[in-house]
């Protein structure tokens, strides 16, 4: 899996989308997890409704929401009030049994709010981005 980069501005919301084959993943719940280290486990942040038919209902865990368009084949994750500590590697996952198949690997980057200079030292600025092979950037 290539890594797709999503960039958001600190304090604002960031929407991450993960497309998938709706028939291939039919009946499967989805999840959003945070990668702990390069080869560490992916820690579950939030998952879709326990009843697959209700996957369209938005579920929240703290400032992170998840909703699944099971017919269209798009999983959407919203990170509300984006903070510097939200930056990092994540995965969209498709679940069956206790198995989790990766739908997309996501790098979340937090950009400085141009109107807020208070914590500028903690924030990532364009130009300091790590290079990701075949990375696709979405705003």
């Amino acid at each position: 899996h290539n890594t797709t980069v999503f960039q958001g501005v600190a304090g604002q919301s960031l929407q991450v989308s993960c497309p998938y084959d709706s028939m291939k993943h039919w009946g499967r719940r989805k999840a959003w997890c945070r990668q702990l280290g390069e080869k560490g486990p992916c820690q579950r942040v939030v998952s879709t409704h326990n009843l697959w038919l209700l996957s369209f209902l938005r579920r929240w865990n703290g400032s992170t929401a998840i909703t699944d368009d099971t017919l269209g084949g798009t999983l959407t994750i919203t990170l509300r009030n984006l903070q510097p500590h939200d930056a990092g590697l994540y995965q969209c996952q498709s679940l069956h049994g206790s198995e989790a198949d990766t739908l997309r690997k996501v790098l979340v980057e937090v950009l400085a709010d141009p109107l807020d200079h208070r914590d500028a030292g903690d924030l990532w600025f364009p130009g300091e981005s790590e290079s990701f092979e075949d990375a696709h950037v979405e705003h």
């Epitope: 291939k24 009946g27 719940r29 697959w52 679940l95 069956h96």
Partner: antibody, heavy 121, light 107 residues
């Protein structure tokens, strides 16, 4: 109704390869995962792997990696399993089965009749 | 891999009996357990999924129960057509694994 018709019995020599087929009817072949299971004479069942005919994506039991290769032909609604470097341990009945997802996990709902593969010099 | 153990390989019972077949997993499988019936002619059918849910068309004399690592299949009123081998299978974790099977005979 759903039917899975497997190919006929095979007698093959040690070291040779065999390709068995499973023709599906009664449902949209491309949209369901297909399972493959091995049963040695008088023994239990072993999961070999599964394939999604829509894009050819396959998952294997580590024990069968390098031994079995799963493919599918959407135009003929047929799933195939090729077994290579055959030994007597590969003598078995091989089943294909259509997978359904129920309550969040996969279940083999419809099974083929099985193909007997005999490896003998 | 998760090991599935059916301790009884062969079971003999009389028509009308209540028969229970057990299956144990080497770790918690979260109720992701299915039961299959293989008739003497080799045909395989799904009986029960998710521990206790009866597949459509399966007679109500079949039932399943269990949790964690211990599961069972019960046939409430044994009939001649129930002569078969019964396999449990876990669908929790890849690779999916089966029990060794329990062959059911009529006394």
């Amino acid at each position: 109704q759903v039917q899975l018709q497997e190919s006929g019995p095979e007698l093959v020599k040690p070291g040779a390869s065999v390709k068995i087929s499973c023709k599906a009817s009664g449902y949209i072949f491309s949209y369901s995962w297909m399972n493959w299971v091995k049963q040695r004479p008088g023994k239990g069942l072993e999961w070999i792997g599964r394939i999604y005919p829509g894009d050819g994506d396959a998952d294997y039991n580590g024990k069968f990696k390098g031994k079995a290769t799963l493919t599918a032909d959407k135009s003929s609604n047929t799933a195939y399993m090729q077994l290579t470097s055959l030994t007597s341990e590969d003598s078995a009945v091989y089943f294909c089965a259509r997978l359904h997802i129920y309550d969040g996990y996969y279940v083999s709902v419809y099974w083929g009749q099985g193909t007997l593969v005999t490896v003998s010099a | 891999d998760i090991q599935m153990t059916q301790t009884t390989s062969c079971l003999s019972a009389s028509l009308g009996d209540r028969v229970t077949i057990s299956c144990r997993a080497s770790q918690d499988i979260n109720n992701y357990l299915s039961w299959y019936q293989q008739k003497p002619d080799g045909t395989v059918k799904l009986l029960i999924y998710y521990t206790s849910k009866l597949h459509s068309g399966v007679p109500s004399r079949f039932s399943g129960s269990g949790s964690g690592t211990d599961y069972s299949l019960t046939i409430g009123n044994l009939e001649q057509e129930d002569v078969a081998t019964y396999f449990c299978q876990q669908g929790d974790t890849l690779p999916w694994t089966f029990g060794g099977g329990t062959r059911l005979e009529i006394k």
